[in-house]
Structure formats: structure tokens, C-alpha cells
Amino acid sequence: GIAIPRNSGCPNSEDKNFPRTVMVNLNIHNRNTSTNPKRSSDYYNRSTSPWNLHRNEDPERYPSVIWEAKCRHLGCVKADGNVDYHMNSVPIQQEILVLRREPRHCPNSFRLEKILVSVGCTCVTPIVHHVA
Amino acid sequence: GIAIPRNSGCPNSEDKNFPRTVMVNLNIHNRNTSTNPKRSSDYYNRSTSPWNLHRNEDPERYPSVIWEAKCRHLGCVKADGNVDYHMNSVPIQQEILVLRREPRHCPNSFRLEKILVSVGCTCVTPIVHHVA
């Protein structure tokens, strides 16, 4: 077979299960300052499906702080400020990548992990189940 | 500052700017099958601020496919199906981590990158600017 082109400066990779462990450069490219989302947008307050942001902190994880959205109401807020329970506030979730220290407390050894986070809430029409 | 406890089995990291490059185990923990979000939830269609999902693929990035939400309307959909332009559909954005191959042809060298993605849309009351 044809060999994979390889730069002479590449780490070695003869293991048949390669790459299980890779070198990752943490000088983050395209970085936007990751601040409390309350500062970057007030949608959480102005939405018809408003949410609260809960700080999820884990010193063994990168990023160590993740903000989780929790919808304030089961229903959606109407123009008059009352909650309409004929509609539903639901969390919009996304799977994200994080780095977890492994072994624990080792500053430069990590495992890639996928976690599901709630980013915000949206107002949806409920699914009505009709009983025969 | 408080020193990070160090296991004797940890890789060495004397660089004062440490960690610039870390070892990452890519056997992903907590994996949920990462599929087209259209299959995992129909909120994008049922929301009062519905959105379309656009495929953003990059063969040199992990995850290689990211689904981007684009709000369908400027306004929000009312119960009768018409759009209310006194309200606004807005994207909920989140900064996520991705891995990008670096140097270009090294199969086990990556750079961590932050990108901003739109996860879904929510309906908000507009900010009205009153002219004096």
C-alpha cells in the first residue's frame, strides 16, 4: 500500500491503535474571551422562555466553568407577563467537548470527554397525545 | 497562588508558560452518539422561533460536522401560524472547543480551537430605543 505522507517533525505513531493519545497545543486559536454569558447577551431575561444560568465548575476540567441554562417556567411568558401553560419552555441542548485531567491532578495529561449542556431555552408548541 | 498537586506519575512540565502542549487521551468518555440534531429533537420545527440547521463540515477538524442554527424569521410565530414582528427570533450562541490538525500532515498533533456556534433560536421582546 501507499504510505501516509509524514512530516519528519511528527510524533511517532507505530501503535496499531494510534492515535489514542495525541499532543494538543493549548494556545487556543480564534479565542473569544469566554465570559459569563449574562454579560454577552440578555436573551436569558428577554426571552418568552426565560432561563437562569447556573455555574458548573470543575477544577479538573477544561473549561473549568460551564454555564448551564435552566428554564424558569414550564410554560412561556406572554406579552402581559403572565405564563401561558398551553406552550412549553424547553432547554436547547448541545454536546460539547471538554478536557478532563487524567490522572487527576496531573497538569498536562487529559482525556477528551463529551458532555451535554443546556445552552438556553425556547418556546415550543406542546405535543398533544390524544387518548383513543 | 496555590500549587497544583502533582502525582509522581505525571508528565514533566517545567516550562513557565505551561501547559502549552498537553497529552490528550482520545478514547472519548461519556460519548453520546453525535448525530444530526434533527433526529434527536424536533424543537427546531415546533419553536415559536423556528430555525433551520445548516451542516458545517471541516475534514481537518474534530468534530468534523457541526450543525449551525439559522433563525427562519425575524419575528416569532404566533398560535395562528402568522409571524409577529413585534417580537424577535434570535440565535442562542455558544462557544465550543474543537480540535484542529496541526501541523498539517501530522496525524497525532492537534491545536485546540474555540468557535462560536448558534445552537438554536429563542423568541425575545425587542429592545426599543426611544428617540428624544
Epitope: 492515535p19 | 472519548i28 452518539t33 453525535s34 481537518e60 474534530y62 460536522v65 490538525r101 498539517r104
Partner: antibody, heavy 120, light 112 residues
Framework: QVTLKESGPGILQPSQTLSLTCSFS??????????VDWIRQPSGKGLEWLAH???????YYNPALESRLTISKDASKNQVFLKIANVDTADTATYYC????????????WGQGTTLTVSS | GVLMTQTPLSLPVSLGDQASISCRSS???????????LEWYLQKPGQSPKLLIY???NRFSGVPDRFSGSGSGTDFTLKINRVEAEDLGVYYC?????????FGGGTKLEID
């Protein structure tokens, strides 16, 4: 050395389901960044990309055929499978599997192909 | 999807001559990341395709330097200097910048 080999039924009747197997060696689908694609080529014609599966079980299909395609894998056996439902004479082709790595190019190794004839 | 159009359909050449194959895409295939995922494959008679060129102009490992790729946006060219007998077959361009991925219709390189 990376090798891939396709196998299939050879002949099917219209409306049957095609089951193809790609058996490979020299790499693992337990490895980060590895994937396998299916591509087909009707006799004397060009190439058409069908489907792809990544090591983490992420799957993608050609939208023109998506409703009929199912790709899956058994990483422990070094195999990838493709099913095509409700075949027709237009599905008569040589079917190739190829390896893909997360990186700057797509299909770096190909199998020899397996031929399917759909005939009543 | 993106339509990839190759010209000519058939290219008769004499051994030792230069051959040039054109591939045109129906829209720009510059990816949002700045790269152009345009590849060239050669399928020799009775064989499966083999990767020659990736990202417009990069030769894959083991590919002789008489093969070169060029172009940008929507227009791409594969050139073969000093054609040898082992170069005969059908050449396909391929784009991986926009989903779903698409191949050109092929150009058959044959002896004049």
C-alpha cells in the same frame, strides 16, 4: 499495510435489500480520526459517493439516497456494512469501500470493489 | 450538490507528451476554512481509483512529480508531464468542500 476488501451477493432481484461488507486490515475503527466510506460506479460510468462512518459512529449519507441507505460497523471485527433497501436496476454497479482519516485528504486507500447486478 | 464537469471526455496522447485535464465546479469549492478540497484520482483499467493530488496541488505519497495540480475557485487543472504507459486510465476530479461530495465524470487518457 492497509487493505480493504468488499463482499456482496453479486446478483439481486428488484425490491430486495443489498447487504455489503467491507473487511479491512492495517488500521482500526477504534482509532480516533478513522473512517470508512462507500462509493459506487455503474459499469462504464463515473463515481458516486454514498455514505461514511466515523470511528465514533457518526454517520453521513448522500441525501439523494439517504432514505434507502444504512451504514454500520463492527470495529472489533474490522468490518463496515452498507445496506441499500429496495434495489432497482439503477443500483447495478461496482461498490467500493475506502478509508478516510480526519485530515487534509479523503480516500487514501480503496478496496478492489464488488459487483452487483440487479435483474429480474 | 456541486456539479463537477471534466473536459475532455477522452484525451489521446503520445507517450512522452504533456497531458492536461480540466475540471470545473458549478460553484466555488473554497471551504469556509480557507482550504480547497479538490482531489484527483486515477483509475487504471480493472483497478480501483488511487489518490494522486489533494487540496488542488499537493501530491499524495508515492505519486511521481510529473503529476501536478493547479487552479482555484471553480477552475482546476491536472497536468501530466512526459506521459508514461502506466499513466493510462480514467482520471476523476473530486470535491470534498461542500456536502454531498461529488466526482467529475472522468477523462480517459489513451494512446494516440
Amino acid at each position: 499495510q492497509v487493505t480493504l476488501k468488499e463482499s456482496g451477493p453479486g446478483i439481486l432481484q428488484p425490491s430486495q435489500t443489498l447487504s455489503l461488507t467491507c473487511s479491512f486490515s492495517g488500521f482500526s475503527l477504534n482509532t480516533f480520526g478513522m473512517g470508512v466510506d462507500w462509493i459506487r460506479q455503474p459499469s462504464g460510468k463515473g463515481l458516486e459517493w454514498l455514505a461514511h462512518i466515523w470511528w465514533d459512529d457518526d454517520k453521513y449519507y448522500n441525501p439523494a439516497l439517504e432514505s434507502r441507505l444504512t451504514i454500520s460497523k463492527d470495529a472489533s471485527k474490522n468490518q463496515v456494512f452498507l445496506k441499500i433497501a429496495n434495489v432497482d436496476t439503477a443500483d447495478t454497479a461496482t461498490y467500493y469501500c475506502s478509508r478516510r482519516e480526519l485530515g487534509p485528504y479523503f480516500f487514501d486507500y480503496w478496496g478492489q470493489g464488488t459487483t452487483l447486478t440487479v435483474s429480474s | 450538490g456541486v456539479l463537477m464537469t471534466q473536459t475532455p471526455l477522452s484525451l489521446p496522447v503520445s507517450l512522452g507528451d504533456q497531458a492536461s485535464i480540466s475540471c470545473r465546479s458549478s460553484q466555488s469549492i473554497v471551504h469556509s476554512n480557507g482550504n480547497t478540497y479538490l482531489e484527483w484520482y486515477l483509475q487504471k483499467p480493472g483497478q480501483s481509483p488511487k489518490l494522486l493530488i489533494y487540496k488542488v496541488s499537493n501530491r499524495f505519497s508515492g505519486v511521481p512529480d510529473r503529476f501536478s495540480g493547479s487552479g482555484s475557485g471553480t477552475d482546476f487543472t491536472l497536468k501530466i508531464n512526459r506521459v508514461e504507459a502506466e499513466d493510462l486510465g480514467v482520471y476523476y476530479c473530486f470535491q470534498g468542500s461542500h456536502f454531498p461530495y461529488t466526482f467529475g465524470g472522468g477523462t480517459k487518457l489513451e494512446i494516440d
